[in-house]
């Protein structure tokens, strides 16, 4: 399944919007830094693009879920957040078509499911952190920076797989 060219552009726009959403300096939040344990290997050890796509879909779905809570709405600029939702929604649509097309073509579907579970657990850790920090501005800034990093890593890995094929 070939993702449209606009998908890569969408990923870049998503990162740009995440950067624009920054409200405070991360340097003022150093005491709140946290290692969420991004499961990078779940994107790196999937040798086929068809196996990575459902995991990337899960990643974007979880980002969408995280930023569409009422706590998130209170933390970020509404206009930027709306644009961010639109970009994520478009990417989910692109990937969904590939997920459906790719059903049954993966070498080990259970491996893919374990990867999806690893991504879900990563977002559980992020949600728990926000809850423990009472959704403070610094907590949200730490999470925004973390999502930028992990989203960038996952899309880069997916792009490198695409160029190998």
């Amino acid at each position: 399944c070939d993702l449209p060219q606009t998908h890569s552009l969408g990923s870049r726009r998503t990162l740009m919007l995440l950067a624009q959403m920054r409200r405070i300096s991360l340097f003022s939040c150093l005491k709140d830094r946290h290692d969420f344990g991004f499961p990078q290997e779940e994107f790196g050890n999937q040798f086929q693009k068809a196996e990575t796509i459902p995991v990337l879909h899960e990643m974007i779905q979880q980002i969408f879920n995280l930023f569409s809570t009422k706590d998130s709405s209170a933390a970020w600029d509404e206009t930027l957040l709306d644009k961010f939702y639109t970009e994520l929604y478009q990417q989910l649509n692109d990937l969904e078509a590939c997920v459906i097309q790719g059903v049954g073509v993966t070498e080990t579907p259970l491996m893919k499911e374990d990867s999806i579970l690893a991504v879900r657990k990563y977002f559980q850790r992020i949600t728990l952190y926000l809850k423990e920090k009472k959704y403070s501005p610094c907590a949200w800034e730490v999470v925004r920076a973390e999502i930028m990093r992990s989203f960038s890593l996952s899309t880069n890995l997916q792009e490198s797989l695409r160029s190998k094929e």
Partner: antibody
């Protein structure tokens, strides 16, 4: 504490349908995959199918396709197995199991279904 | 579908003995991407649901005693109990965790003399 609580025993007439439930506590079903497994008296284990409650995607063993329907309700943290038009072959213990980390790592206590007129 | 053949069907042993049971797959359960064998072992005691013992052919589930060891690669797998205890009386099933439909072996029944 992770637990899967299944509904009670069912006596079903051949051709009628029955819906079994499996309620999770200690975790959110939408973060996992829920499987259903059948075990006939003194027999081995047969995989029926599974659901990803986050999106409703299901997979079935071809032998159960059309005979079993797996659904989930994330608001009540419950997964369901509906058996349609069972025959005496449907008499078995039905287990739900979750894939929280790896493989089927948590199991319900099982629901006994007896198909008899 | 992947077929799993377990042997022997029944094992009768004395407490303290070492036992091994076999599970052979009709096709390789090795994933080339992460070099893991997608074979799982379950233990089912009388009147109880199955319990996960070993996943990825050799990784022991947390809380499982270290007398249980899984080994094997590709199509041939073994579950070893180094020193059988009375509480190990159960049926042991291997399961294909590699591809759908998931399939189970017919089981090996462990009896204590």
């Amino acid at each position: 504490h992770v637990k899967l609580q299944q509904s009670g025993a069912e006596l079903v007439k051949p051709g009628a349908s029955v819906k079994l439930s499996c309620t999770a506590s200690g975790f959110n079903i939408k973060d996992t995959f829920i499987h259903w497994v059948k075990q006939r008296p003194e027999q081995g284990l047969e995989w029926i199918g599974r659901i990803d409650p986050a999106n409703g995607y299901t997979k079935y063993d071809p032998n159960f396709q059309g005979k079993a329907t797996i659904t989930a309700d994330t608001s009540s943290n419950t997964a369901y197995l509906q058996l349609s038009s069972p025959t005496s072959e449907g008499t078995a213990v039905y287990y739900c199991a979750s894939r929280v980390d790896y493989a089927m790592d948590y199991w319900g206590q099982g629901t006994t279904v007896t198909v008899s007129s | 579908d992947i077929e799993l053949t377990q042997s022997p069907a029944t094992l009768s042993v004395t407490a303290g003995e070492k036992v091994t049971m076999s599970c052979k797959s009709s096709q390789s359960l090795l994933n080339s991407g992460n070099q893991k064998n997608y074979l799982t072992w379950y233990q089912q005691k009388p009147g109880q649901p199955p319990k996960l013992l070993i996943y990825w052919a050799s990784t022991r589930e947390s809380g499982v005693p270290d007398r249980f060891t899984g080994s094997g690669y590709g199509t041939d797998f073994t579950l070893t109990i180094s020193s059988v205890q009375a509480e190990d009386l159960a049926v042991y099933y291997c399961q294909n965790d590699y591809s759908y439909p998931l399939t189970f072996g017919a089981g090996t029944k462990l009896e204590i003399k």
